[in-house]
């Protein structure tokens, strides 16, 4: 487990001719915020995939009003880092998408309006625990400067956050075959995966799945200190020494969750369930209204027009929590019958059926499907003695072995060409057209029919403004 951290240094006009118009004006003040989306690996097939490694939204930046006649300067930025926690190993190679959003603060009916100002994407190789990596990306006439790093959350260490560390049992050296844990030289590498929840500070293991306690600690997860003094109400001897058991300091002791959040222990740390109006790792972000966009994963925000009234997030299927921040493991209900494999795709459940079975939940026994497999989560459907595959989203062909083309819906208008780039589909417009989907004609005088062209969008610009 660990955290990917992104620090935005500046967002403003890039070098070269054609400086963009300021996105804000005296009539229409605005402020910026950023969204980062991370995907593991370098797969070209990830074009339309969700942010499987995680996503994060920044706070809103300071309100900015353009000075009349002045060129667009570097725009004021939100404070702080964007942090994307990752639960499993850091993949080492990843794809990113960073979006710059503009929140217009004029007199719009129904609150502020949001529009995507710029979108950059890239593929990078990055080891966890390394220094900050600096980057510059350009989107049209805009330039984004930022730094990023991945760091492990204790007790994980290493370039992939897969090695675990524990305190040394002896002051001078680590056990046989174990190295010191850089940069924590007073700790030793623990190569084994101990029992889930085994205290990283007070427990260790010599066999996978066990949890042995260091001197002075007891309990199945070594979270309970052994009192060597006499006790008023002893609870029984410990397995290590005879003494009294006192509840040890667990991750939820002292309740790290602010603002009335409730704490629950997880195998490696804790998780806060926040009351409405608060969110963040420790429920520390407050005064939230629907204008702040608190609902994640496509949740719909209702109510909460001012900071004193609560908002409610209506979550899409597959997500729960006061901010739709938690993915529901709907496969735990075992909805797939006849030995089918359950796939939770986020937007839908899919059952990958064994040969001979079909249907949304593998409920149909099909003789003509016996021995005929549909690949990639497709289901076999009976069709008058011949087998036919109903393919999962993103796949096609007779046996669902062909990856469906994000360009199949012909999203680029007026003869524009669509390309299935790893960062998302890209349109290259035919001469005379422009826009994200080549939807706007370019007039002979060079003007476009764009009602209010996003800054930096020029004739022939590719899809970068969604």
């Amino acid at each position: 487990a660990g955290v990917f951290e992104l620090q935005i240094h500046s967002f403003g006009p890039g070098p070269g001719p054609g400086a963009p118009r300021s996105p804000c004006s005296a009539r229409l003040p605005c402020r910026l915020f950023f969204r980062v989306c991370l995907k593991p690996g370098l797969s070209e097939e990830a074009a339309e995939s969700p942010c499987a490694l995680g996503a994060a939204l920044s706070a809103r930046g300071p309100v900015y009003t353009e000075q009349p006649g002045a060129p667009a300067p570097d725009l004021p930025l939100p404070d702080g880092l964007l942090q994307v926690p990752f639960r499993d190993a850091w993949p080492g190679t990843f794809s990113f998408i960073i979006e710059t959003w503009r929140e217009e603060l004029g007199d719009q009916i129904g609150g502020p309006a949001w529009s995507l100002l710029a979108r950059v994407a890239g593929r990078r190789r990055l080891a966890a625990g390394g220094p900050w990596a600096r980057d510059i990306q350009r989107a049209g006439a805009w330039e984004l400067r930022f730094s990023y790093r991945a760091r492990c959350e204790p007790p994980a260490v290493g370039t992939a956050c897969t090695r675990l560390c524990r305190p040394r049992s002896a002051p001078s050296r680590c056990g046989p075959g174990l190295r010191p844990c850089a940069p924590l030289e007073d700790e030793c590498e623990a190569p084994l995966v101990c029992r889930a929840g085994c205290s990283p500070e007070h427990g260790f293991c010599e066999q996978p799945g066990e949890c042995r306690c260091l001197e002075g600690w007891t309990g199945p997860l070594c979270t309970v200190p052994v009192s060597t003094s006499s006790c008023l109400s002893p609870r029984g001897p410990s397995s290590a020494t005879t003494g009294c058991l006192v509840p040890g300091p667990g991750p939820c002791d002292g309740n790290p969750c602010a603002n009335g959040g409730s704490c629950s222990e997880t195998p490696r740390s804790f998780e806060c369930t926040c009351p409405r109006g608060f969110y963040g790792l420790r429920c520390e972000v407050s005064g939230v209204t629907c204008a702040d966009g608190p609902c994640f994963n496509g949740g719909l925000c209702v109510g909460g027009a001012d900071p004193d009234s609560a908002y409610i997030c209506h979550c899409p299927p597959g997500f729960q929590g006061s901010n739709c921040e938690k993915r529901v493991d709907r496969c735990s209900l075992q909805p797939c019958r006849n030995g089918g494999l359950c796939l939770d795709l986020g937007h839908a459940l899919r059952c990958r059926c064994r040969a001979g079975f079909a249907g949304p939940r593998c409920e149909h026994d099909l003789d003509d499907c016996a021995g005929r497999a549909c690949a990639n989560g497709g289901t076999c459907v009976e069709g008058g003695g011949a087998h036919r595959c109903s393919c999962a989203l993103g796949f096609g062909g007779r046996d669902c072995r062909e990856r469906a083309d994000p360009c199949a819906a012909r999203p680029c208008a007026h003869g524009g060409r669509c390309y299935a780039h790893f960062s998302g589909l890209v349109c290259a417009c035919a001469p005379g057209y422009m826009g994200a989907r080549c939807e706007f004609p370019v007039h002979p005088d060079g003007a476009s029919a764009l009602p209010a062209a996003p800054p930096g969008l020029r004739p022939g610009d590719p899809q970068r403004y969604l």
Epitope: G16, G18, E44, I136, Q137, R138, G140, A141, G396, G397, E402, R403, A404, D405, P406, C407, A408, R410, R417, C418, Y419, A420, H421, F422, S423, L425, V426, A428, C429, A430, P431, R458, G460, D461, P462, R464
Partner: antibody
Framework: QVTLRESGPALVKPTQTLTLTCTFS?????????MGWVRQAPGQGLEWMGT????????DYASWAKGRVTISVDSSKNQFSLKLSSVTAADTAVYYC???????????WGQGTLVTVSS | DIQLTQSPSFLSASVGDRVTITCQST????????LSWYQQKPGQPPKLLIY???NLEIGVPSRFSGSGSGTDFTLTINSLEAEDAATYYC??????????FGGGTKVEIK
Amino acid sequence: QVTLRESGPALVKPTQTLTLTCTFSGFSLSSSYDMGWVRQAPGQGLEWMGTIYTGDYSTDYASWAKGRVTISVDSSKNQFSLKLSSVTAADTAVYYCARHTGYGYFGLWGQGTLVTVSS
Amino acid sequence: DIQLTQSPSFLSASVGDRVTITCQSTESVYGSDWLSWYQQKPGQPPKLLIYQASNLEIGVPSRFSGSGSGTDFTLTINSLEAEDAATYYCQGYYSGYIYAFGGGTKVEIK
């Protein structure tokens, strides 16, 4: 493993038509790409010849290649091909096939095949 | 016809030097930044270094960087290494689905 591999004759006589084939693996033409041909005469620079867009199989050629070059696709064999008519000694070159998936760059290249035009 | 002019066509530099190669187009590339840079060593196909004017391809050392927009672009090698001896090409993509390559810059280590 995503790969491209060129094949064809190593020696062609002047005035003949050169036919080269690029066999691809690890991806299918159900996605939209430009599949292109680029050549490089000995000791010279790279020269784009033309591309075929797999979305609708439309073709585009360098101005010098129009009328001499034809690019086509056989998706059932995972191949696309180049025909260059009326070859001369000036067409002696290493011929590369390459794939474009957006933002204008060729991200995947074959190893190239040397074709010599000589009588 | 569109022309991409690279300069210099040849340069000799020492290990550790900062090297700059420029690429000038007679027409603006598509989207103002659809320009890429390749490295080619003898007997090998070109290897992509930079795409979209400034994006570093995965696995390419960070000493390589690209900049520019419209018609003028630059490839910079911040601290030249012996393994960087090669020929470097710029390549643009243009409205009308047209590609073009620069003439190349041969980099030699002194």
